[in-house]
């Protein structure tokens, strides 16, 4: 009685259960009455990452330097190449098919989270008591200078973009 379902890592063809090809190999010939499934290793720059019956291996992803990409992990016969972005850039999608420059946080905003190869800079407004006077992809909000600890007094109040200005105490008192 011909089978209607096959075991794991097998497939049904011509009323026979044939072994799937292992990762890293492609199908040449289905199994027959006389032979096991015939599989061949994927070529250079090709891969198959599952037990399969594919007659062609997939091409490794190309990390195009013109798009700001570089190889993070070289592909094998069983895995695809993983791309990431050059320093200062990050991926535009999870598949990392192209890169964009990390955004900078404007004055009045500081870096909450520095960008990675896959995520952009996260900025946050500088709260009261903190400031940022530069546009930067790395600088956090800095605390205002404490005039008191320097035996000075505030001459000009700080903002989210400027530090306080300290000055000497009034000696006429």
């Amino acid at each position: 009685e011909p089978p209607t379902a096959c075991r794991e890592k097998q497939y049904l063809i011509n009323s026979q259960c044939c072994s799937l090809c292992q990762p890293g190999q492609k199908l040449v010939s289905d199994c027959t009455e006389f032979t096991e499934t015939e599989c061949l290793p994927c070529g250079e720059s090709e891969f198959l990452d599952t037990w399969n019956r594919e007659t062609h291996c997939h091409q490794h992803k190309y990390c195009d330097p013109n798009l700001g990409l570089r190889v993070q992990q070289k592909g094998t016969s069983e895995t695809d190449t993983i791309c990431t972005c050059e320093e200062g850039w990050h991926c535009t999608s999870e598949a990392c098919e192209s890169c964009v420059l990390h955004r900078s946080c404007s004055p009045g905003f500081g870096v909450k989270q520095i960008a990675t190869g896959v995520s952009d800079t996260i900025c946050e407004p500088c709260p009261v008591g903190f400031f940022s006077n530069v546009s930067s992809a790395f600088e956090k909000c800095h605390p205002w200078t404490s005039c008191e600890t320097k035996d000075l007094v505030v001459q000009q109040a700080g903002t989210n973009k400027t530090d306080v200005v300290c000055g000497p105490q009034d000696r006429l008192r």
Partner: antibody
């Protein structure tokens, strides 16, 4: 439909090289394997060797040193070459596909001076 | 090289009677995948061999159900439940588990 047809020289002199071609139709040699069997007159079947779909070959232990099997997928042909022939190589030579029951009609090769 | 030994060499049978042919292998024919690639052919006089049974016990399409195959490991049997005139010829066992593939020496079935 699936067909295999052998074409041989018929008569070959001792010590010469035998060349037989198996021309197939109805399937691709890149996806199917083909093997060769011979049968001397009044005797049994002898497996000679095979050409796998992927291009690799296997040979009978006793014939390995003088047998070469190759294929031209674009021409749908598998070739058998056997050197240093003797009278003992007189036989009907068959090519066979490695699934189902697809045999060529066979070609008789006589080795004689 | 693996040897397949068939017995008997010659088998005279009366029409309508059963027949049995043995095939012994010099090593196990069970493959690593669990398949056993032992097959049976019939070669009628003046014809190419014809596949009867593949992988021990599977009847090839169009083969009458009076033919059956059994066995495992190294011992295999072809049985014909009731011999008919068209069953005359030479029966060969064959294995494709191990390279090089091999054929048995043949069993000639004739009518008494």
């Amino acid at each position: 439909q699936v067909q295999l047809q052998e074409s041989g020289p018929g008569l070959v002199k001792p010590s010469e090289t035998l060349s037989i071609t198996c021309t197939v139709s109805g399937f691709s040699l890149s996806r199917y394997s083909v093997y060769w069997v011979r049968q001397p007159p009044g005797k049994g079947l002898e497996w000679m060797g095979m050409m796998w779909g992927g291009g690799s070959t296997d040979y009978s232990t006793s014939l390995k040193s003088r047998l070469t099997i190759s294929k031209d997928t674009s021409k749908s042909q598998v070739s058998l070459k056997m050197s240093s022939l003797t009278a003992a190589d007189t036989a009907v030579y068959y090519c066979v596909r490695t699934d189902g029951d697809y045999w060529g009609q066979g070609t008789l090769v006589t080795v004689s001076s | 090289e693996l040897q397949l030994t068939q017995s008997p060499l010659s088998l005279p049978v009366t029409l309508g009677q059963p027949a049995s042919i043995s095939c012994r292998s010099s090593q196990s024919l069970a493959s690593s995948s669990g398949n056993t690639y032992l097959h049976w052919y019939l070669q009628r006089p003046g014809q190419s061999p014809r596949l009867l049974i593949y992988k021990v016990s599977n009847r090839f399409s169009g083969v009458p159900d009076r033919f059956s195959g059994s066995g495992s490991g190294t011992d295999f049997t072809l049985k014909i439940s009731r011999v008919e005139a068209e069953d005359v010829g030479v029966y060969y066992c064959s294995q494709s588990t191990h390279v090089p593939w091999t054929f048995g020496g043949g069993t000639k079935l004739e009518i008494k």
